[in-house]
């Protein structure tokens, strides 16, 4: 609290060291998600427990589809309000085609670069959203083995909302993306029923991710 | 500097199998950033894509080819491996290995593959 | 399956010339998927542009590539005597994988 009596943020150096991450979310925005409000919303709670800034941790967003868009860089903002603002303002592309390995290569060669922000030494946290099997899952073992050959932590996360719109059998997909979060895959792979039930992992997800740091 | 040569019998007998094996150098293939693949030939033709396969032992084929083809890698050998069965004289080709990563950037010289009785 | 279509089927030019080669896709394909390789007469390919128009190693600056979604463009500014050969485009973004059927660069 500060003379004035006004609650004041004040970071000791220990604890502001043990928040420095890198984050990239990697979101996919294929013509299939559907509501994309649900996927703002998620982001919005994610983000709003974070602690952003240039000397903690710092968040890029990427969206993909048949294209890969980078929709901010890791260090395009520099606190959580800011990057809230931005983070609502993103509208899905959309495309017939989901690249997943594309989305995934891109933001290890491109996001997680010094030019884009990225800081050497800061461990390095995808989050990968995916409703729907990738078209290009042929070049998933190399996109995978280049980001744990650079140490990038994976978080993945299947919709399975257009599966059960349409009583489809998730199993393929599950398996797809169970293969893209690092392991042990069951501390980084996350499946909600549908896109709406998005915010219910948020708090776990939040959780997992800054326990990177412990 | 990385190269790949294809070895295996130049004719083969319809129904049989063809089989080929291409050998690595300068380099080990179970770095993960690679796939190693087989590619065709047709005489005086265009280029086919048979499939390829990851260190870990992922295969990938065309669908066109799958029922037929095996591809396999033995890493301790550093070689991966082509079998092709019930072939016929629409499978006369030219077969290349390659590496591929952002496109096929390393391949072996080719080898004539010629199905006759 | 993704079918590529190259066109001409020969181009006959002089050293010297400018060459523009054409590949079009049956469907929307991501330029980080679509690659050019060069082959001659009893030789394998060689890889000269990833990415659509990233140059390989090694490769001279007079060959560039250009185009999205379902055209794409290899160009060769200035021929060299060493250019004349066939040309394939290729696509890895969905299997399988594809080639064009190639275009012959041939001396006029």
């Known amino acids: 609290v500060s003379p004035t009596f006004q609650v004041v943020n004040s970071i000791a150096p220990v604890q502001e060291c043990s928040t420095q991450l890198d984050i990239v979310i990697v979101l996919d925005g294929s013509n299939s998600i559907y509501p994309w409000d649900s996927v703002t919303a998620f982001l919005n709670d994610l983000l709003e427990r974070m602690d952003i800034g240039p000397k903690q941790t710092q968040v890029g967003i990427v969206q993909y589809g048949e294209n890969v868009t980078h929709e901010f860089n890791l260090n395009k903002y520099s606190s959580t309000e800011e990057v809230l603002v931005a983070a609502k303002k993103i509208g899905r592309r959309g495309g017939l085609q989901t690249m997943t390995a594309l989305g995934i290569d891109t933001a290890r060669k491109e996001a997680f670069t010094e030019a884009r922000g990225a800081r050497r030494g800061v461990k390095k946290v995808m989050v990968i959203v995916t409703d729907g099997e990738s078209h290009d899952n042929h070049r998933l073992k190399k996109v995978i083995q280049d980001c744990e050959d650079e140490n990038i932590q994976r978080f993945s996360i299947a919709i399975l909302g257009s599966y059960n719109r349409g009583n489809l059998s998730t199993e393929k997909f599950v398996e797809e993306i169970k293969s893209i979060a690092s392991e042990p895959t069951e501390k980084h792979f996350f499946n909600v029923s549908d896109e709406l039930a998005l915010v219910t992992i948020v708090k776990t997800l939040g959780e997992r991710i800054f326990a990177l740091e412990a | 500097q990385v190269q790949l040569q294809e070895s295996g019998p130049g004719l083969v007998k319809p129904s049989q199998t063809l089989s080929l094996t291409c050998t690595v150098s300068g380099g080990s293939i179970s770095r993960g950033n690679y796939y190693w693949s087989w590619i065709r030939q047709h005489p005086g033709k265009g280029l086919e894509w048979i499939g390829y396969?990851?260190?870990?032992?992922?295969?990938y084929y065309n669908p066109s080819l799958k029922s037929r083809v095996t591809i396999s890698v033995d890493t301790s050998k550093n070689q991966f491996s082509l079998k092709l069965s019930s072939v016929t004289a629409a499978d006369t080709a030219v077969y290349y290995c390659?590496?591929?990563?952002?496109?096929?950037?390393?391949w072996g010289q080719g080898t004539t593959v010629t199905v006759s009785s | 399956e993704i079918v590529l279509t190259q066109s001409p089927g020969t181009l006959s030019l002089s050293p010297g010339e400018r060459a523009t080669l054409s590949c079009r896709a049956s469907?929307?394909?991501?330029?980080?998927?679509l690659v050019w390789y060069q082959q001659k007469p009893g030789q394998a390919p060689r890889l000269l542009l990833y990415d659509a128009s990233s140059r390989a190693t090694g490769i001279p600056d007079r060959f560039s590539g250009s185009g999205s979604g379902t055209d794409f463009t290899l160009t060769i500014s200035r021929l060299e005597p060493e250019d004349f050969a066939v040309y394939y485009c290729?696509?890895?973004?969905?299997?399988?994988?594809?080639f064009g059927g190639g275009t012959k660069v041939e001396i006029k």
């Open positions: 290729q696509q890895y973004g969905n299997s399988p994988l594809t």
């Open positions: 396969i990851f260190y870990s032992g992922s295969t």
């Open positions: 390659a590496r591929d990563g952002y496109g096929m950037d390393v």
């Open positions: 469907q929307s394909v991501s330029s980080s998927y």
